[in-house]
Amino acid sequence: MMTGTIETTGNISAEKGGSIILQCHLSSTTAQVTQVNWEQQDQLLAICNADLGWHISPSFKDRVAPGPGLGLTLQSLTVNDTGEYFCIYHTYPDGTYTGRIFLEVLESSVAEHGARFQIP
């Protein structure tokens, strides 16, 4: 029986050009974690395997960094990075757990907009 739960950072926002850490945490289970997959809208970004460690998909190597922990760091963010991200935990004997994070990448901060358009 699957007793575990995944806690995620939920809905997050970050600035274009910046970086963000995606984090998931599996709790309430003693299941062995075989692997964690990170996906963005049907694309595999990275894998953290219990035996082999990290594998980053070639098309994301420049902008994705492993960690911290089982998390994933996205760098040099663009507006196109806005969307759903999923952490998929492969465990035994429970099976597969999925967590969802929604990332919104903003053009620039409100503070910058305010400064740029200040009336003298």
């Epitope: 692997q35 997959n37 894998i47 035994y92 597969t96």
Partner: antibody, heavy 119, light 107 residues
Framework: EVQLVESGGVLVKPGGSLKLSCAAS????????MSWVRQTPEKRLEWVAT????????YYPDSVKGRFTISRDNAKNILYLQMSSLRSEDTALYYC????????????WGQGTSVTVSS | DIQMTQTTSSLSASLGDRVTITCRAS??????LNWYQQKPDGTVKLLIY???RLHSGVPSRFSGSGSGTDYSLTISNLEQEDIATYFC?????????FGGGTKVEIK
Amino acid sequence: EVQLVESGGVLVKPGGSLKLSCAASGFTFSNYVMSWVRQTPEKRLEWVATITSGGTYTYYPDSVKGRFTISRDNAKNILYLQMSSLRSEDTALYYCTRWLLSLYAMDYWGQGTSVTVSS
Amino acid sequence: DIQMTQTTSSLSASLGDRVTITCRASQDISNFLNWYQQKPDGTVKLLIYYTSRLHSGVPSRFSGSGSGTDYSLTISNLEQEDIATYFCQQGKTYPYTFGGGTKVEIK
């Protein structure tokens, strides 16, 4: 080209033991999770065992736990299934399978080796 | 254990037909559903994984869909080489389990 070639299937008496082998080629064997899946005479498919890429973890269904042992030799690119205390219900065609790196599915299967448990 | 049910054990269709094979899980499997093809000679190939992702080298006439407990495999334009038995498999919860198979034959 990915190739998985099973061997070792024979006729064995109930209570007996048997070791199946699967020779892998055409890919970096040590990077992949591997499994054994069997097909019964009634054509039902059943997952039998799984081993992680480095051999650190092994997983089994209750039906074979304590009787079957999956292992691997990454230097020789061979997957094994040691079967003991065999029962008539273990009669099946045994397939060696490779898992996708994502672990979502088994992407390559061997041709199978036949095991018959009968007195 | 999760039971996987393929209610149609065999079906006959004509070449060029659109064929749909269904699979039902006894509980929600969150799209962790795969489809395999077994040819009459016993050769097994992965067609679709994670409900709708086409495995590399598989013709685009194959597609998968579904959610929750109900899933389907569609062959949009049946060809002679598609004569085979099709199995679904869930990868949500151990032990991973398979459907009983659906044999596709030519009318």
